[in-house]
Amino acid sequence: GQNITARIGEPLVLSCKGAPKKPPQQLEWKLNTGRTEAWKVLSPQGGPWDSVARILPNGSLLLPATGIVDEGTFRCRATNRRGKEVKSNYRVRVYQIPGKPEIVDPASELTASVPNKVGTCVSEGSYPAGTLSWHLDGKLLIPDGKETLVKEETRRHPETGLFTLRSELTVIPTQGGTHPTFSCSFSLGLPRRRPLNTAPIQLRVREPGPPEGIQLLVEPEGGIVAPGGTVTLTCAISAQPPPQVHWIKDGAPLPLAPSPVLLLPEVGHEDEGTYSCVATHPSHGPQESPPVSIRVTETGDEGPAEGSVGESGLGTLA
């Protein structure tokens, strides 16, 4: 048999080998496709099947607009002018090339040593489903489940039967200072069909380094509070992913669960002291904030104690 590949919506003509080009002809076309349950013999006189498969005067079979349900086997049996029986057998597959794939929600930059979502590659309207592949600097990226992670999703349209593919790429770049170029390609896996490529995206990789700033905010401002009052300490860090935050009082760690906020309700003199927060990042060591002083006083009219937070209520690391 012969394998035939036809584009969805396009006409297809299958020739009946051995059939005389003009009537009288002795021939029989039969098909077994998604429209049939078994073999369907087509009437030479034509009929309701003509809209999907029609016998032409020269004995060939015309499929005016191939669809997914027309995939299957087509057979012709003809008797030639010399009375010899000739058989033709075709295996028909259909395809649809999707629109150009796109990288949606691309990253603006990447951070070395931590997982980064590069973007999601989307291809819409393919048949069969096909595959999406990622490329780094023009070379095929093979997901290893560690430094290179790909999350794939395939959906089929309930009416058209066409596929939408999504592929989300996450990478852990090893070093900063580089400018890798990522692209994605769609392939139907058919012979003589070149892959469709997205426009490439070039991203800067920066070293994680310390966060740009770790600030300790105190409420009330100045860190002076009357007995029974409440003090709120907030450790503000501009780092992704958010690090774990521990608290230190007078140089000793406080036995509390990690949290960027420390609440001291109904303070007494035992809560007085110097507080700081320590942020621990996965990619580098712990980082401590500047300290703030908490004073509990009856009058509340004293100025800031030495070493306490100034007017802004912020302790900023230079």
């Epitope: 349950e37 369907k40 009437s43 034509g46 009929g47 309701p48 809209s51 999907v52 029609r54």
Partner: antibody, heavy 119, light 107 residues
Amino acid sequence: EVQLVESGGGLVQPGGSLRLSCAASGFTFNNYWMTWVRQAPGKGLEWVASIDNSGDNTYYPDSVKDRFTISRDNAKNSLYLQMNSLRAEDTAVYYCARGGDIRVSLDHWGQGTLVTVSS
Amino acid sequence: DIQMTQSPSSLSASVGDRVTITCRASQDVGIYVNWFQQKPGKAPRRLIYRATNLADGVPSRFSGSRSGTDFTLTISSLQPEDFATYYCLEFDEHPLTFGGGTKVEIK
């Protein structure tokens, strides 16, 4: 909304001719085969003719072949049935319907037009 | 030509009854059978297409089934508006052939 409206029915003498029309709206006319079906008074339904979407291919039962001609004008979204050599047994309500092939078969019908063949 | 033998030609039933109408094709027609409902003075209305599929806007009490060349229309619980004549149609081959019809009357 799909609408099919037949016209052209009436009283005609045996041996006479009549042309029925069907005006289609609410769908892309040239995407569909079209069909005429008739129903004699108090009787069942009988297929009369079908035409493919381009109008290139027409189909008839033996009872009307060579007497009736189905045609279409896709620019006007119209279907026609030219009936010649009419006989008393052609008396019926004639319906136009959308489809007639294996993809879509008679999913929408017109209200019908009565043809009476009598002397 | 294909014959579509429809039975019964008429039946009497009450509201709430389960009603079954059958069409037998004289040769294999695959799934290419429709069912229609017709009320006096009105055009036929398609109920079931390709043997088992419910047409748009048709109540779910109507269903179609197939076993080889036997096709069945079932009304699970007959309603007052269901008293009408029902036809099957084969559209696998020309000439397109309708069954003779089944008139469903009030008992």
